[in-house]
Amino acid sequence: PSPPPEKKELRKVAHLTGKSNSRSMPLEWEDTYGIVLLSGVKYKKGGLVINETGLYFVYSKVYFRGQSCNNLPLSHKVYMRNSKYPQDLVMMEGKMMSYCTTGQMWARSSYLGAVFNLTSADHLYVNVSELSLVNFEESQTFFGLYKL
Amino acid sequence: PSPPPEKKELRKVAHLTGKSNSRSMPLEWEDTYGIVLLSGVKYKKGGLVINETGLYFVYSKVYFRGQSCNNLPLSHKVYMRNSKYPQDLVMMEGKMMSYCTTGQMWARSSYLGAVFNLTSADHLYVNVSELSLVNFEESQTFFGLYKL
Amino acid sequence: PSPPPEKKELRKVAHLTGKSNSRSMPLEWEDTYGIVLLSGVKYKKGGLVINETGLYFVYSKVYFRGQSCNNLPLSHKVYMRNSKYPQDLVMMEGKMMSYCTTGQMWARSSYLGAVFNLTSADHLYVNVSELSLVNFEESQTFFGLYKL
């Protein structure tokens, strides 16, 4: 008899987009509407929750903009939290200082992306230093990953 | 008898590089010479044409530069067009304003990359706001994807 | 009799982080401690050495910062060297000019990432123009790849 058909495993993948009702850190994300993807990974209170240990490519982009440049330092972090560890682990980070001309309308993006070995129950989050300067358009601010 | 050797499917992948004879939008790309890759995906009039539905990581970098900064707003978009939909869908976008000192020679890059669920016959393109400010060196300006 | 269990091939992957004792080009990397990954790829004198021909996604981020901006041109390159070729091949590059306000403390990142067809024995390196302006925190400056 021929072997049973191979069970095609669902790809573990997420692509979440900016959600403008984020009021505090970590950033919250749109996980339902638009160009969102969420498969084999859970979304909980701003975080992507890993349910299978392995190698993942993790990425995020944040779009900062303002009307009267004051050059407040900007930071954009992807960090990991796991109940086994007391402290958050910053996986990737981008910082900007002195990036625009005083008083001018300005806009700038930060992009992060890299490979990490993640463990089941790891929670991944995105943090920014100046929430009021983030624009949450779905094409501009996003957070995602996929299992290699 | 031993089973027939497994047929190794060709990876669906593209990496196209800047083509300086781009005269209008969308940007056109070098699809033949240099560090170019094109396998299982077609290139047509500036666009990458998907021929198999699935999850893809899509990326692009554009290198902007000028001789005398006047801070024209810069935008860099990856968008999708499909005959089934009336309107282009902006998948990823980067914008820059107030990014250099007036009158100075300047240079800046925009990088975009994320995962999307693409459908057979989707056409992907790259658009920029200021074509005259783009440098098309193959290492500096590129557009690519691969099927997960 | 049932077939022998399938041998799960180790994923070819690397994620190296900034090493502050880099004194010259190419940059050197931390390959042992912290959030480092190195599997199926070798690290040798700043370079990632490919041992299996194929398609790879290669990425790097470099974090530049300074105490008093004088707008020195910054460049960040990922390049490839192979004994069969006389010259280095620049795969990806980012350049910045006129990016901060003279005399101010400043900070800026450059991110690169794309797909390449690499050959066994290819050596991949990262080069920057101003080593003294690079910050080597593991979350800020890194270099990695994975085989598709």
């Epitope: 303002g66 009267s68 004051n70 407040l72 005083t102 008083g103 309308m105 009021s132 300067l133 | - | 101010q104």
Partner: antibody
Framework: QVQLVQSGAEVKKPGASVKVSCKGS????????IHWVRQAPGQGLEWMGV????????SYNQKFKGRATMTVDKSTSTAYMELSSLRSEDTAVYYC????????????WGQGTLVTVSS | EIVMTQSPATLSVSPGERATLSCKAS??????????MNWYQQKPGQAPRLLIY???NLESGIPARFSGSGSGTEFTLTISSLQSEDFAVYYC?????????FGQGTKLEIK
């Protein structure tokens, strides 16, 4: 509550300099740029320039470049605007106003400082 | 620089009536879906007070009888039913780029 309190009225001779102060309170001073606007008697409003309260550098209206100098003292949450080589047409009320980077306009203004230039 | 032109220079209206003030910019003050046009009210001996930002948004604490409209180069401030405290000078101002510029003002007086 948010307040921008400016220094008192000044009378100056032509050719002299004047330095007007603007002290912010009731908010995080370094989160907002400070703009300076003047108004000659019976005339409209004229934008002079803006200073980054965080970084300390300024952008000026071309008309005042070389004569106006904007500075900030973060320790006292105070912005300053100095105008040199004064002439009679510089007689005006000088206002400071804060501008939130994430918003669209100058939302709070100082009460104004009258500078009179007369020989 | 962008030149702002207000009209009329003076507008005489009776209390309870509607007032419509106009402002034209020498070039578009729109960018990326927003109009960078603001309106201020100034009374004698006082600092200007922000009424409307981004062409049509009412500043916190400003009565709902004030409204703004327009885009591109043409903008309008409307006061639906004039109260005695509304008689003042009104300025439009763009914040699209530096230098910011103001209109010359419209004086709203009691008819």
């Amino acid at each position: 509550q948010v307040q921008l309190v400016q220094s008192g009225a000044e009378v100056k001779k032509p050719g002299a300099s004047v330095k007007v102060s603007c002290k912010g309170s009731g908010y995080t001073f370094t989160d907002y740029t400070i703009h300076w606007v003047r108004q000659a008697p019976g005339q409209g409003l004229e934008w002079m320039g803006v200073i980054s309260t965080y970084q300390g550098d300024a952008s000026y209206n071309q008309k005042f470049k070389g004569r106006a100098t904007m500075t900030v003292d973060k320790s006292t949450s105070t912005a300053y605007m100095e105008l040199s080589s004064l002439r009679s047409e510089d007689t005006a009320v000088y206002y400071c106003a804060r501008f939130p980077d994430w918003d669209y306009a100058m939302d709070y203004w100082g009460q104004g400082t009258l500078v009179t230039v007369s020989s | 620089e962008i030149v702002m032109t207000q009209s009329p220079a003076t507008l005489s209206v009776s209390p309870g009536e509607r007032a419509t003030l106009s402002c034209k910019a020498s070039q578009s003050v729109d960018y990326d879906g927003d109009s960078y046009m603001n309106w201020y009210q100034q009374k004698p001996g006082q600092a200007p007070r922000l009424l409307i930002y981004a062409a049509s948004n009412l500043e916190s604490g400003i009565p709902a009888r004030f409204s703004g409209s327009g885009s591109g180069t043409e903008f309008t401030l409307t006061i639906s039913s004039l109260q005695s405290e509304d008689f003042a000078v009104y300025y439009c101002q763009h914040s699209r780029e530096l230098p910011y510029t103001f209109g010359q003002g419209t004086k709203l007086e009691i008819k």
